[in-house]
């Protein structure tokens, strides 16, 4: 009798249960970017290491051609850090008619591309003015949040200036996502 | 009959399922650091509060001697924020032959130690030049990402200068990890 | 016989298992803030979009009156980013008796309110001195960590100066939480 009482709820909730270990997951790490032309008003996408060192993709989460491919619908936590580095930004020295000029800036955007949708969707943006005085500078921008994604969605990381990205260490610049 | 049809798939997927509530988890919070000797070229590790206030460890995730001990293999999300504070860095004012000197910087590293492996592995690094003008300064560095860890791995947080860490509030400087 | 051997462990661990898809989750995005009175020494709370664009609440996680309501006890990952923007902070130029004045700053606090407890609890704080030279400035503060919450707890995001918050884009300023 006890078994019979238990069965219905067991059957009712069983279907959506799944082992955590088989959920799509990826952690990608920075590689040196190859020289490419990119349009002036479009932020270029970074490409990534997906299997060497700390990088991995698993459970049908694949990386191809700068994109992470989402293999199943659900809620994902998505994160990225990009470390930027540069020589002095002279933004504080150049003034027009005594007025501060537009600051230099660094920006990271995590973008979702859905094939059935014409425009990419910006999921996360970190943007920072850079107005350093008298020295080299370096700093990270970190982003992370949860989004509902559909099977077939593609994720990429875009930056305002690819030449400012620190590609020297896998722990400084990275990109990841995992199904919750 | 229905039960018989259901049984195979139940037995097949059941083993790896586990209750979310029993997964290893920890959130550690800052405490005032005790002065310790550390080698000149090695970043010192922070020690942490693990049970008072917001801090906790649970489900066999233990904290001991600056390390979080990983009790079972799997994919973990690891995070830390360190808030730094200091007096004015005059890096922009001191010049050699009209040349800006090397900037001061603040750095946080989350490091993995595996007993069977001679060298620690840097999992995450946040590093920032500090060239503030005319005032005291304070700022956080935040890090977080997912890594595949093995049972017995140990995690610690290293900083470039322990004397600059803001230890005054548990919400400003913290370190955590949880099994996904 | 096999079924009988299996049953006890099944019944023993079954109760806490639950489908990941039915866990409380929310991602809230920035909206333009309505002018409100707030006490001088108290950081104002932001209000949020909870259903348009990228924003959502699900599985009994509700948003009401600047608060996220926690519908069940457990360990939650909570995160927020606030992008600030402002005109030049002249903090380095104004000195009293040759001494640098107290720097301007920007601060984000994620706060927990428990009705049975008189004082709100600050879970996370990101605070940064702002001493920019010669230009407009903008920058994000990101926070994220895991906390043990109780059913009925309420979460909000407070900022040091609501007029500096960039409310222009949903990907720049956001707040979220999900049950682990």
């Amino acid at each position: 009798l006890k078994g019979q009482e238990f069965a219905p709820s067991h059957q009712q909730v069983y279907a959506p249960l799944r082992a955590d270990g088989d959920k799509p997951r990826a952690h990608l790490t920075v590689v040196r970017q190859t020289p490419t032309q990119h349009f002036k008003n479009q932020f270029p996408a970074l490409h990534w290491e997906h299997e060497l060192g700390l990088a991995f993709t698993k459970n049908r989460m694949n990386y191809t051609n700068k994109f992470l491919l989402i293999p199943e619908s659900g809620d994902y936590f998505i994160y990225s850090q990009v470390t930027f580095r540069g020589m002095t930004s002279e933004c504080s020295e150049i003034r027009q008619a005594g007025r501060p000029n537009k600051p230099d800036s660094i920006t990271v955007v995590i973008t979702k591309v859905t094939d059935s949708y014409p425009e990419p969707t910006q999921l996360l943006m970190g943007t920072k003015s850079v107005c350093e005085v008298g020295s080299n500078w370096f700093q990270p921008i970190y982003l992370g949040a949860m989004f509902s994604l559909q099977e077939g969605d593609k994720l990429m990381v875009n930056v305002s200036d690819i030449s400012l990205v620190d590609y020297t260490k896998e722990d400084k610049t990275f990109f990841g996502a995992f199904l919750l | 009959l229905k039960g018989q049809e259901f049984a195979p798939s139940h037995q097949q997927v059941y083993a790896p399922l586990r209750a979310d509530g029993d997964k290893p988890r920890a959130h550690l919070t800052v405490v005032r650091q005790t002065p310790t000797q550390h080698f000149k070229n090695q970043f010192p590790a922070l020690h942490w509060e693990h049970e008072l206030g917001l801090a906790f460890t649970k489900n066999r995730m233990n904290y001991t001697n600056k390390f979080l001990l990983i009790p079972e293999s799997g994919d973990y999300f690891i995070y830390s924020q360190v808030t730094f504070r200091g007096m004015t860095s005059e890096c922009s004012e001191i010049r050699q032959a009209g040349r800006p000197n090397k900037p001061d910087s603040i750095t946080v590293v989350i490091t993995k130690v595996t007993d069977s492996y001679p060298e620690p592995t840097q999992l995450l690094m946040g590093t920032k030049s500090v060239c503030e003008v005319g005032s005291n300064w304070f700022q956080p560095i935040y890090l977080g990402a997912m890594f595949s860890l093995q049972e017995g791995d140990k995690l610690m947080v290293n900083v470039s200068d322990i004397s600059l860490v803001d230890y005054t509030k548990e919400d400003k400087t913290f370190f955590g990890a949880f099994l996904l | 016989l096999k079924g009988q051997e299996f049953a006890p462990s099944h019944q023993q661990v079954y109760a806490p298992l639950r489908a990941d898809g039915d866990k409380p989750r929310a991602h809230l995005t920035v909206v333009r803030q309505t002018p409100t009175q707030h006490f001088k020494n108290q950081f104002p709370a932001l209000h949020w979009e909870h259903e348009l664009g990228l924003a959502f609440t699900k599985n009994r996680m509700n948003y009401t009156n600047k608060f996220l309501l926690i519908p069940e006890s457990g360990d939650y990952f909570i995160y927020s980013q606030v992008t600030f923007r402002g005109m030049t902070s002249e903090c380095s130029e104004i000195r009293q008796a040759g001494r640098p004045n107290k720097p301007d700053s920007i601060t984000v606090v994620i706060t927990k309110v428990t009705d049975s407890y008189p004082e709100p609890t600050q879970l996370l704080m990101g605070t940064k001195s702002v001493c920019e030279v010669g230009s407009n400035w903008f920058q994000p503060i990101y926070l994220g960590a895991m906390f043990s919450l109780q059913e009925g707890d309420k979460l909000m995001v407070n900022v040091s100066d609501i007029s500096l918050v960039d409310y222009t884009k949903e990907d720049k300023t956001f707040f979220g939480a999900f049950l682990l």
């Epitope: 590689v31 040196r32 970017q33 190859t34 020289p35 490419t36 032309q37 990119h38 290491e49 060497l52 580095r85 540069g86 020589m87 930004s89 080299n136 200036d161 690819i162 030449s163 400012l164 990205v165 020297t168 | 040349r99 800006p100 | -």
Partner: antibody, heavy 119, light 111 residues
């Protein structure tokens, strides 16, 4: 001390390929990117591309894309640059150079390899 | 496509000071990694003189210094010596992550 020793001079016919080697010593070969730079007689320096000896990843100048291949043999700490479909204007001294990771300056240079393309 | 422009030649007597300029066709000369300077003496491989606008690698005499102003970088040699005669190149990285070299400047030490 750090040394980059390149292979000897080569004479090639138009349309042929040449493979120049660069043997590294005095440092951990996989820790630094190698760049290749060439210099035509009486001309300036021209960058061809970079190689990461650890991963094998490469980045080539647009001008040489499709004609150049850079590889590494980690067991012998040797980098290679192969240029195909040679023409007379490829006559030059070819240099390998080790890069400073932080600034991407070319800190150490090989002695150069003269490649002559002539029918 | 960015271009780095150097004067084809400069000259000076021993003991004098000479400056070689390197001007970028784009506004952000070496924004990410700076401008580097190389010396190439006759019949030899280039040698790194200055990295990141200002920094002298060990072994480079302090007679060599680098500076930056707006879209130009400069190499200054003080106390010119006969053995400084040779070609000098500036180098940077453009926005597409391609390395650029200036056309080179021939330094002649008079006398």
């Amino acid at each position: 001390q750090v040394q980059l020793v390149q292979s000897g001079a080569e004479v090639k016919k138009p349309g042929a390929s040449v493979k120049v080697s660069c043997k590294a010593s005095g440092y951990t070969f996989t820790s630094y990117d190698i760049n290749w730079v060439r210099q035509a007689p009486g001309q300036g320096l021209e960058w061809m591309g970079w190689l990461n000896p650890n991963s094998g990843y490469t980045g080539y100048a647009q001008k040489f894309q499709g004609r150049v291949t850079m590889t590494a043999d980690r067991s012998t700490s040797t980098a290679y640059m192969e240029l195909s479909s040679l023409r007379s204007e490829d006559t030059a001294v070819y240099y390998c150079a080790r890069e400073v990771p932080e600034t991407a300056a070319f800190e150490y240079w090989g002695q150069g390899t003269l490649v002559t393309v002539s029918s | 496509q960015s271009v780095l422009t150097q004067p084809p030649s400069v000259s000076g007597a021993p003991g004098q000071r000479v400056t070689i300029s390197c001007t970028s066709s784009s506004s952000d000369i070496g924004a990410g990694l700076g401008v580097h300077w190389y010396q190439q003496l006759p019949g030899t491989a280039p040698k790194l003189l200055i990295e990141g606008y200002y920094n002298r690698p060990s072994g480079v005499p302090d007679r060599f210094s680098g500076s930056k102003s707006g879209t130009s970088a400069s190499l200054t040699i003080t106390g010119l010596l006969p053995e400084d005669e040779g070609d000098y190149y500036c180098q940077s990285w453009d926005g597409t992550l391609s390395a650029l070299f200036g056309g080179g400047t021939k330094l002649t030490v008079l006398g």
